[in-house]
Interface confidence: low
């Protein structure tokens, strides 16, 4: 079972959180965007999205970097920085951002009702839209065996998540994705077809991506990727507003 919480698209850019926690490797991020008929955004595309109101409080992959787009300064989101904040120490798993070239130029909150480029597979994939509607598909999108293979839980795998919020400058609600802290059950590997036994959370330690670029701010992992505890319950099925956890 894989749950993919997605946000509205801003200039084609959107945020994807998997299974309510930082659990996407760089290779899986590319595969995931591809499944959405999208690509990892470039820095320029992310900056364009920022300019039309896109901000979150979650680290996610773009092409070459791990970033948080920030419009309003917030001490618990990218350490009060604004702009496209780059995480300079990225050796872990994060969320991802994707870019859909055919999306409207500004904001698009229509529900996603397909994962067009997923292929046949045994996994139940649920797309959770900002309005709470769900699209369920059985299939697979990962191609890197390390993203599929059995993995071992670490502290990061059970860390709490935080809000992915829509900017108040675009005049709307705050959208919070909800993260549940829970241990990873042992897995037998990709040959398992019972999706209830499959909650991959493999680490991609081999990846290291440089930071840098214009119109950006930089930070180390400690600048915002901290662990927190759950502040409250969550309504994961109805309405766009979800109770946040301590943002990372």
């Amino acid at each position: 079972q894989i749950d993919l919480n997605i946000t509205c698209r801003f200039a084609g850019v959107f945020h994807v959180e998997k299974n309510g926690r930082y659990s996407i490797s760089r290779t899986e991020a590319a595969d995931l965007c591809k499944a959405f008929n999208s690509t990892l955004p470039t820095m320029a595309q992310m900056e364009k999205a920022l300019s039309v109101g896109f901000e979150t409080c979650r680290y996610g992959f773009i092409e070459g970097h791990v970033v948080i787009p920030r419009i309003q300064p917030n001490s618990i989101c990218a350490a009060n920085h604004t702009g496209v904040y780059i995480l300079t120490s990225n050796t872990s798993q994060y969320d991802t951002y994707c870019f859909n070239a055919s999306a409207p130029p500004k904001e698009d909150c229509t529900s996603v009702t397909d994962l067009p480029n997923a292929f046949d597979g045994p996994i139940t994939i649920t797309i959770v839209n900002p309005d709470g509607t769900r699209y369920i598909k059985k299939g697979e999108y990962r191609t890197n065996p390390e993203d599929i293979y059995p993995s071992n839980p670490t502290d990061d795998d059970v860390s709490s998540g935080s809000s992915s919020e829509r900017s108040s400058t675009s005049g709307g609600y705050i959208f919070h994705t909800f993260s549940t802290a829970h241990p990873i059950p042992d897995e037998d590997g990709p040959w398992i077809t019972d999706s209830t036994d499959r909650i991959p959370a493999t680490r991609d330690q081999d990846a290291f991506y440089p930071s840098g670029g214009s119109h950006t701010t930089h930070g180390s992992e400690s600048a915002g990727h901290s662990h927190g505890s759950q502040e409250g319950g969550a309504n994961t099925t109805s309405g766009p507003v979800r109770t946040p956890q301590i943002p990372e």
Partner: antibody, heavy 117, light 108 residues
Framework: QVQLVQSGAEVKKPGASVKVSCKAS????????MHWVRQAPGQRLEWMGW????????KYSQKFQGRVTITRDTSASTAYMELSSLRSEDTAVYYC??????????WGQGTLVTVSS | EIVLTQSPGTLSLSPGERATLSCRAS???????LAWYQQKPGQAPRLLIY???SRATGIPDRFSGSGSGTDFTLTISRLEPEDFAVYYC?????????FGGGTKVEIK
Amino acid sequence: QVQLVQSGAEVKKPGASVKVSCKASGYTFTNYAMHWVRQAPGQRLEWMGWINTGNGNTKYSQKFQGRVTITRDTSASTAYMELSSLRSEDTAVYYCARFYSGSGSPWGQGTLVTVSS
Amino acid sequence: EIVLTQSPGTLSLSPGERATLSCRASQSVSSSYLAWYQQKPGQAPRLLIYGASSRATGIPDRFSGSGSGTDFTLTISRLEPEDFAVYYCQQYGSSPLTFGGGTKVEIK
């Protein structure tokens, strides 16, 4: 740099046991499962099983079930594969492997186990 | 278990030529969970391709993989001297993980 370094060659008599070690470095040992694969002379590669290095849980190929035991020592970042009731057809090179990564699939250098009376 | 049959057993080619290696599975390989390895004498296998068609980091683009279901192909577009080796396919979609018997690519 991710590296898996295995113990040296062994010569064993039929019926004996052998224990091969695999020391990992360059990554967090408990974050990845470790697999064991063997290759008899001129034969195809054979998967033996794997261990969840975090909790110690194992999964073995049916062919080796009951004869193979895979363990790990997290403090030493080392995985072990013990094969018992050795027979001549167990003569092979035994590899530990951290399946997989888009940046490569780290394998140990291999340990030759010779079973001979 | 899934049995992987590789053909041909030996491929005799010259540097610069194109090599096409086949791997056929006895039953469908789930979600294209298929990898290709290169092995040289006295060395451990080296991962070339995973997910049937994704190249591992550092693998030259002359190596490409294709196929799904039961039929998979590894293509080396232009053989270099260092490419002469044994190539194995492996499925990791069902237990036990299994390997093909290998194709030896030798210099003609």
